[in-house]
């Protein structure tokens, strides 16, 4: 009976047994609902939508990291339907800590304002002085890890979202 | 029973406007991905738009020959579908359809269509 | 786009023969993405095969699919008066999603 299906399964009626719902490709995502023993009439995969991709099976289609804005970092190379962006290196005036845990956006540019000083990616872009560089407020005094939270927010989603 | 009922077809003068709306019931319409397809008289079937659901942010997709010109909405709480027509054209003359997304993209249910005839 | 070709434009059959239309992609098209619609004069299409090969609900069984690629194809193996109607297949491969010109099949 289809109460014992699993999640990724619906009821056949025709054999009696539960059946694996249809999987996804690469670039799509499940359509509808299927699993627990139920599968929608109109169930299947869609592609996904501009700026998401999926590896498929039963995955949903997530967001492009942005590399740029949420990283400030480039893009080594940009996403497509089946695979993520791939973050490069920081974006000017901005450097990734070193011996630093990844957090849970991963490798996170931090401003130069707040950098140490002789900071490799920084030097010649006055590392701790008050100069102005994208997307940062001269006269700030947050912390780095408070800097870089104050930038990533205002996003409209996670890099994984 | 799927149900899908265009209306706000007629006669309109070339570069005129035209609202569509496709009234639903029998299933659950917010889940759903929803599209707009045409026929002009004696013709094949044209594609025209499709608006994806609240979990995909409502996003839309066009034909490029419609694009900038017709918009596709959605309003979940009404359950209506519509399509606003601007710059209409001789060449817009067509029954209207509304339809069901299905998985892989087919059409699994349709309406009986509105007549949407540019005219001077 | 991708343009779909259906041949013939017209066909006319007997009942009780079998008969195959075509559908051409300009380019490869996923099969599970080909669909076929019928469509009877002055009447609403409705989904008649989906991805190939797969018989919507009430469709009779002497209605098949098959096509891989940029070749598709409809056959109904034994066709009877109500078939008489338009057939068009739809694909997507990617925006925007295009169907064919139809092929008209009648009975004699």
């Known amino acids: 009976e289809y109460s014992n299906c699993g999640e990724n399964e619906y009821y056949n009626q025709t054999t009696g047994l539960c059946q694996e719902c249809p999987p996804c490709g690469p670039g799509e995502e499940p359509y509808l609902s299927c699993g627990y023993g139920t599968k929608d009439e109109d169930y299947g995969c869609v592609p996904c939508p501009a700026e998401k991709f999926s590896k498929g099976g039963y995955q949903i289609c997530r967001r492009h990291k942005d590399c740029e804005g949420f990283f400030r970092a480039t893009v080594l190379t940009p996403g497509d339907m089946e695979n993520d962006a791939e973050c490069g290196p920081c974006l000017p005036g901005y450097y990734m800590l070193e011996n630093r845990p990844r957090n849970i956006y991963g490798m996170v540019c931090y401003s130069c304002l707040l950098a140490p000083p002789n900071t490799k990616e920084c030097v010649g872009a006055t590392s701790g002085a008050s100069a102005n560089f994208p997307g940062t407020s001269g006269s700030s005094t947050l912390s780095p890890f408070q800097h870089a939270h104050k930038e990533l927010s205002g996003q409209g989603h996670l890099a994984t979202a | 029973e799927v149900k899908l009922e265009e209306s706000g077809g007629g006669l309109v003068q070339p570069g005129g406007s035209l609202s569509l709306s496709c009234a639903t019931s029998?299933?659950?319409?917010?889940?759903?991905?929803m599209t707009w397809i045409r026929q002009p008289p004696g013709k094949a079937l044209e594609w025209l738009a499709l608006?994806?659901?609240?979990?995909?942010?409502?996003?839309?997709e066009d034909s490029p020959s419609v694009k900038g010109r017709f918009i596709i909405s959605r309003d979940d709480s009404q359950r209506i579908l519509y399509l606003q027509m601007n710059a209409l054209r001789d060449e817009d003359s067509a029954t209207y359809y509304c339809?069901?997304?299905?998985?892989?993209?087919?059409?699994?249910?349709w309406g009986q269509g509105t007549l949407v005839t540019v005219s001077a | 786009d991708i343009v779909m070709t259906q041949s013939p434009a017209i066909m006319s059959a007997s009942p009780g023969e079998k008969v195959t239309m075509t559908c051409r992609a300009s380019?490869?098209?996923?099969?599970?993405?080909l669909h076929w619609y019928q469509q009877k004069s002055g009447v609403s299409p409705k989904l008649w095969i989906y991805?190939?090969?797969n018989l919507a609900s009430g469709v009779p069984v002497r209605f098949s699919g098959s096509g891989s690629g940029t070749s598709y194809s409809l056959t109904v193996s034994s066709v009877e008066a109500e078939d008489a109607a338009t057939y068009y297949c739809?694909?997507?491969?990617?925006?925007?999603?295009?169907f064919g010109g139809g092929t008209k099949l009648e009975i004699k």
């Open positions: 339809a069901t997304v299905g998985g892989y993209y087919r059409f699994p249910s």
């Open positions: 029998g299933f659950p319409f917010s889940d759903y991905y």
């Open positions: 608006i994806r659901n609240k979990a995909n942010g409502y996003t839309t």
């Open positions: 380019s490869s098209v996923s099969s599970s993405y």
């Open positions: 991805s190939t090969s």
């Open positions: 739809q694909q997507y491969s990617d925006y925007p999603l295009t």
